[in-house]
Interface confidence: low
């Protein structure tokens, strides 16, 4: 239902964010990814 599509949308967003982060500097990649994973856990 609606929840599933929202989750799918979030995953797509997260995946692009991960790609963007890995393109940037090492330090920011690690720090930002920590925040994303925390956000993902918190959304469950």
């Amino acid at each position: 239902g609606g929840g599933g599509s929202k989750h799918k949308c979030f995953r797509k967003d997260l995946e692009q964010n991960e790609t963007l982060e890995s393109i940037m500097s090492t330090a920011e990649s690690e720090e930002e990814l920590k925040r994303y994973f925390y956000y993902l856990e918190g959304s469950k």
Epitope: F10, D13, L14, Q16, N17, T19, L20, S22, I23, M24, S25, T26, A27, E28, S29, E32, R35, Y36, Y39
Partner: antibody
Framework: QVQLVESGGGVVQPGRSLRLSCAAS????????MHWVRQAPGKGLEWVAV????????HFADSVKGRFTISRDNSKNTLNLQMNSLRAEDRAVYYC???????????WGQGTMVTVSS | DIVMTQTPLSSPVTLGQPASISCRSS???????????LSWLQQRPGQPPRLLIY???NRFSGVPDRFSGSGAGTDFTLKISRVEAEDVGIYFC?????????FGPGTKVDIK
């Protein structure tokens, strides 16, 4: 001091290839994503491509996808842009830029001119 | 793709007077990390672009404090509090929120 110096530009016929290089100095090259941005004469800026600090992730503008490849050699502090099947619309000054913390292109080279003409 | 527009495209200003440039994006530049990846670049005649402002309002190192950035979501502004001769050039906004990264068309600032 932090510096980026592009080279490899020149005049090339349509359909031919050219390889641009960018020599980095004054910072830890292997810790930064690197970009290519171009500017046609008298026009605006167009983002071309980016490569991650480790070379494992790459992304391209649709206008160059399948024709251009981006690579880097962290042992030599060098960024490359291999341009194949060049078109008249690829004529531009090509800048390399450092992708820093906060998703910003903070340091730019002076640019190298690519002219595609028969 | 996110389309960036700027107004005005040309801005003749008087030395010592303020100048303002507007930038609008076709969709929100807020990413899920809460940051807005909007930068301003200056390109003086015959020179490469130079970073002025990142993440809407953060001045890059060495940038004079007469430059300031503001805005949110889709609408952003670059202000020069008192224009100096060295400020002549083209100013671009740029989004790095989403691939492909895109630039505004540029605003030419010159002296009246």
């Amino acid at each position: 001091q932090v510096q980026l110096v592009e080279s490899g530009g020149g005049v090339v016929q349509p359909g031919r290839s050219l390889r641009l290089s960018c020599a980095a100095s004054g910072f830890t090259f292997s810790s930064y994503g690197m970009h290519w941005v171009r500017q046609a004469p008298g026009k605006g800026l167009e983002w071309v491509a980016v490569i991650s600090y480790d070379g494992n992730n790459k992304h391209f503008a649709d206008s160059v996808k399948g024709r251009f490849t981006i690579s880097r050699d962290n042992s030599k502090n060098t960024l490359n842009l291999q341009m194949n099947s060049l078109r008249a619309e690829d004529r531009a000054v090509y800048y390399c830029a450092r992708g820093a913390s906060g998703f910003v292109l903070d340091i730019w080279g002076q640019g190298t001119m690519v002219t595609v003409s028969s | 793709d996110i389309v960036m527009t700027q107004t005005p495209l040309s801005s003749p200003v008087t030395l010592g007077q303020p100048a303002s440039i507007s930038c609008r994006s076709s969709q929100s530049l807020v990413r899920s990390d809460g940051n807005t990846y909007l930068s301003w670049l200056q390109q003086r005649p015959g020179q490469p672009p130079r970073l002025l402002i990142y993440k809407i309002s953060n001045r890059f190192s060495g940038v004079p404090d007469r430059f300031s950035g503001s805005g949110a979501g889709t609408d952003f502004t670059l202000k020069i509090s008192r224009v100096e001769a060295e400020d002549v050039g083209i100013y671009f906004c740029m989004q790095t929120t989403q691939f492909p990264f895109t630039f505004g068309p540029g605003t030419k600032v010159d002296i009246k």
